[in-house]
């Protein structure tokens, strides 16, 4: 495929990445799938600059990101290393809380109203952010 040089319509460019901000809610897995179908992934936050950019666009609304621990350790959906990477958890989080009565703990991370991160039940219908890198090859065939 050809290298993507500009963001698709309705996506926002920032630091060589493109972002799409939902205005409806989905469970984490559905949001993850939505981004994949767009040749993208749920947002992976790697810096303060990116955190502030996303926070500015989503406002004080619970919003899924591409971070989960459904298979044990915390993992970013694009393979970015969690252990050494940027983190912005709320105090006392993540806590894998079981007291919500919905079964299981909390395995998916989201931005909270102040931008800090929390782990929550993956089935909750939160907004989400998709991200794709401008430098990566597009899956679309090149125009002849």
């Amino acid at each position: 495929g050809s290298e993507r040089t500009c963001c698709p319509v309705n996506w926002v460019e920032h630091e060589r990445s493109c972002y799409w901000f939902s205005r409806s809610g989905k469970a984490w897995a559905d949001a993850d799938n939505y981004c994949r179908l767009e040749d993208a992934h749920l947002v992976v936050v790697t810096s303060w600059e990116e955190q502030k950019f996303v926070q500015h666009h989503i406002g004080p609304v619970n919003t899924w990101m591409g971070l989960h621990d459904q298979n044990g350790p915390w993992k970013w959906v694009d393979g970015t290393d969690y252990e050494t990477g940027f983190k912005n958890w709320r105090p006392e989080q993540p806590d894998d809380w079981y007291g919500h009565g919905l079964g299981g703990g909390e395995d998916c991370a989201h931005f909270t109203d102040d931008g800090r991160w929390n782990d929550d039940v993956c089935q909750r219908p939160y907004r989400w952010v998709c991200e794709t890198e401008l430098d990566k090859a597009s899956q679309e065939p090149p125009l002849l």
């Epitope: 790697t46 810096s47 303060w48 600059e49 290393d81 252990e83 050494t84 990477g85 983190k87 958890w89």
Partner: antibody, heavy 115, light 108 residues
Framework: QVQLVQSGAEVKKPGASVTVSCKAS????????MYWVRQAPGQGLEWVGT????????DYAQKFQGRVTMTRDTSTSTLYMELNSLRSEDTAVYYC????????WGQGTLVTVSS | SSELTQDPAVSVALGQTVRITCQGD??????ASWYQQKPGQAPILVIY???SRPSGIPDRFSGSTSGNTASLTITGAQAEDEADYYC???????????FGGGTKLTVL
């Protein structure tokens, strides 16, 4: 595995400048925040500053503002710290560290400031 | 500016449990990380984000936070745990790193 290899010891006179380098290997250089931390003889750890190798943005401790410059060369995966207007109190081991939680550390570079 | 306060020295009998504390207002908002430093060596990260251990760090090391105090606990201290221990965290902006003054741990 992640390795941070720093340049050798330096002896400088008061008022001079010093540049310490830190070559990273074993990971994608742009992926990890990098830090400089110093330790004066017999003293504790002191944060000097931070650089995001991806975009190059920096944050410096207030006491070093105007005297320190951190840069990086992504083509060689090398981090640099320049400290100007050296004084005897700057005598310390300077460490580079990488990862948001300062997960990996270099071996340290002793900078001695003496007339 | 933010400050983190540690006890200068703590001792523990071999095989016993010891807790090293770190106090500061920034710990209400940001987690402490803990580092072990032995003489003539670079520091090593032992605990980060609440109570996470990097690979290779023994499970006798654990971390916790309550209010403005973070704690590093070593359960069943070994002779090789004798070292200086430093906490760090972020200032209120989240950008700047702050270190505690360090605690010298002696294993008796």
């Amino acid at each position: 595995q992640v390795q941070l290899v720093q340049s050798g010891a330096e002896v400088k006179k008061p008022g001079a400048s010093v540049t310490v380098s830190c070559k990273a290997s074993g990971y994608t250089f742009r992926s990890y925040y990098m830090y400089w931390v110093r330790q004066a003889p017999g003293q504790g750890l002191e944060w000097v500053g931070t650089i995001n190798p991806s975009g190059g943005s920096t944050d410096y401790a207030q006491k070093f503002q105007g005297r320190v410059t951190m840069t990086r060369d992504t083509s060689t995966s090398t981090l640099y710290m320049e400290l100007n207007s050296l004084r005897s109190e700057d005598t310390a081991v300077y460490y580079c560290a990488s990862g948001w939680e300062l997960n990996y550390w270099g071996q340290g570079t002793l900078v001695t400031v003496s007339s | 500016s933010s400050e983190l306060t540690q006890d200068p020295a703590v001792s523990v009998a071999l095989g016993q449990t010891v807790r090293i504390t770190c106090q500061g207002d920034s710990l209400r908002n940001y987690y402490a990380s803990w580092y072990q430093q032995k003489p003539g060596q670079a520091p090593i990260l032992v605990i980060y984000t609440k109570n996470s251990r990097p690979s290779g760090i023994p499970d006798r090391f654990s971390g916790s936070t309550s209010g403005n105090t973070a704690s590093l606990t070593i359960t069943g201290a070994q002779a090789e745990d004798e070292a200086d221990y430093y906490c760090n965290s972020r200032d209120s902006s989240g950008n700047h790193v702050v270190f505690g003054g360090g605690t010298k741990l002696t294993v008796l």
